[in-house]
């Protein structure tokens, strides 16, 4: 039982499923990164607190022409209850620091693993 990959199918979908998929996508990005991610584009750093998913999307959506994070952008939109457009900053309460997309993804990944560990799947 220590190596449970998936639950019996068909069966109830665990609440962890969507967060697991997002984490796996960010892991893929960090592991497959060869050249600077998104050509070294800079994005607003976010507070990893309430409203974090919308804030993350609002920050990343301003990166255009970067196919590596397009799936992440789509997945984050599933966690954010409102529509997010480029240039929108309603959830980004503090916009004082910009970091590279690669660092943003690493920070987000660490935090999402913490949420997973804590059983916070909302």
């Amino acid at each position: 039982l220590t190596c449970l990959g998936g639950f019996a199918s068909p069966g109830p979908v665990p609440p962890s499923t969507a967060l697991r998929e997002l984490i796996e996508e960010l892991v893929n990005i960090t592991q497959n990164q060869k050249a600077p991610l998104c050509n070294g584009s800079m994005v607003w750093s976010i507070n990893l607190t309430a409203g974090m998913y919308c804030a993350a999307l609002e920050s990343l959506i301003n990166v255009s022409g970067c196919s590596a994070i397009e799936k992440t952008q789509r997945m984050l939109s599933g966690f954010c209850p409102h529509k997010v457009s480029a240039g929108q900053f309603s959830s980004l309460h503090v916009r004082d620091t910009k970091i590279e997309v690669a660092q943003f993804v690493k920070d987000l990944l660490l935090h999402l693993k913490k949420l997973f560990r804590e059983g916070q799947f909302n």
Epitope: L4, V27, F116, R117
Partner: nanobody
Framework: EVQLLESGGGLVQPGGSLRLSCAAS????????MAWVRQAPGKGLEWVST???????TYYADSVKGRTISRDNSKNTLYLQMNSLRAEDTAVYYC?????????????WGQGTLVTVSS
């Protein structure tokens, strides 16, 4: 050493109730989400319910509505209150500790407690 020890299972008639407990040790219980997972005879593992580290968020499989997951962080104990039990609830019930890995949602499991619903 992390240990999860389930108790409270047994033989109960249809419509009856049981409260399962899971005593945790060897880690900071209050920092981790916990879950109940069950395995019916001859079937695969089935997720039942999840509770967040602080108890604020709870999640249930549709098939087990009417159950209540709870935790007492001061006692390092996880609970599952099961009312209106049916024959389909017969299974070994495991508690599990959340930790992300590519292979699994959990890094530690208990040894399980058997619930048998029969008249």
């Amino acid at each position: 050493e992390v240990q999860l020890l389930e108790s409270g299972g047994g033989l109960v008639q249809p419509g009856g109730s049981l409260r399962l407990s899971c005593a945790a040790s060897g880690f900071t219980f209050a920092d981790y989400g916990m879950a109940w997972v069950r395995q019916a005879p001859g079937k695969g593992l089935e997720w039942v319910s999840t509770i967040s580290y602080n108890g604020l968020y709870t999640y249930y499989a549709d098939s087990v509505k009417g159950r209540t997951i709870s935790r007492d962080n001061s006692k390092n104990t996880l609970y599952l209150q099961m009312n209106s039990l049916r024959a389909e609830d017969t299974a070994v019930y495991y508690c599990a500790k959340y930790e992300y890995s590519p292979e699994s949602d959990f890094d530690y499991w208990g040894q399980g407690t058997l619930v048998t619903v029969s008249s």
